[in-house]
């Protein structure tokens, strides 16, 4: 029986050009985590294997960094990075647990826009 639950950072936002940490945590199970996959739609961003370490998919190598921990750091964000991200925990003997994070990448903040047009 699968007793575990995944806690995630939920719905998050970040500014264009900035970076964000995607984080999931599996709790309430004694199952062994063998691998965590990070995904966006049908794209595999990265794999963190308990024995072998990290593999970042070549398409994302320039903009994705492993960690902290089992999390994933997305860098040089663009508006196209807006969307759903999934952490897939492969465990033994439980099987697979999935967490969802929604990321919204925003244009520069209102405060910054405002500062640009202030009258001296």
């Amino acid at each position: 029986m699968m007793t575990g639950t995944i806690e995630t950072t939920g719905n998050i936002s970040a500014e264009k050009g900035g970076s964000i940490i995607l984080q999931c945590h599996l709790s309430s199970t004694t199952a062994q985590v063998t691998q965590v996959n990070w995904e966006q739609q049908d794209q595999l961003l990265a794999i963190c294997n308990a024995d072998l370490g990290w593999h970042i998919s070549p398409s994302f190598k320039d903009r994705v960094a492993p960690g902290p921990g089992l999390g994933l750091t997305l860098q040089s964000l663009t508006v196209n990075d807006t969307g759903e991200y999934f952490c897939i925990y492969h465990t033994y003997p439980d099987g697979t647990y999935t967490g969802r994070i929604f990321l919204e990448v925003l244009e520069s903040s209102v405060a910054e826009h405002g500062a640009r047009f202030q009258i001296p």
């Epitope: 063998t34 996959n37 072998l52 990290w54 593999h55 998919s57 492969h90």
Partner: antibody, heavy 120, light 107 residues
Amino acid sequence: EVQLQESGPGLVKPSETLSLTCAVSGYSITSDSWNWIRQPPGKKLEWMGYISYSGNTYYNPSLKSRITISRDTSKNQFSLKLSSVTAADTAVYYCARLDFSNYGGAVDYWGQGTTVTVSS
Amino acid sequence: DIVMTQSPDSLAVSLGERATINCKASQNVRTAVAWYQQKPGQSPKLMIYSASYRYTGVPDRFSGSGSGTDFTLTISSLQAEDVAVYYCQQYYTTPWTFGGGTKVEIK
């Protein structure tokens, strides 16, 4: 250039233990992942398991009760033991390296393979 | 375990013509797919990883595509030295599994 060379008996009796060794040159087995893969005649390639750079092992669950992969870092070699063999274990056995960081689970270096026949 | 099913089992193509090999995964493996070439009497050689990335030294007539459950290896202009058996493999999750192979011959 990474080179892998399998060695061991070509004939094993049913119920006995199959033992193979893979000698690695041109690269240290304390980096990356070192695998055994087999191909029974007329059948698919079957990934059997690995020993990681740190010495951790992972075995295909279909073989888990019978397989042991170990290593000797002083000789830069790793070994396969498969117990209680039957005719179904007759195959070409390959040792192989996998650079998980760069290529994920894709195997980039293979030995030339050794044929093992299980027969009385 | 994830089952990788290749089609066709064998393929005869004229020299200089296009060869297309298909691989279907029993569940979504995103882009965690590799392709290997195995010539008679030799061990497999890595050709493509991450579904579409050519391994070092692989000629550009070889290309891979697909994501999810359906993948394709294409040889754009078949050469005599391409005669071999080609295998797909998934590494989305362990145990890593292979397809049954497609034999490519010259027509």
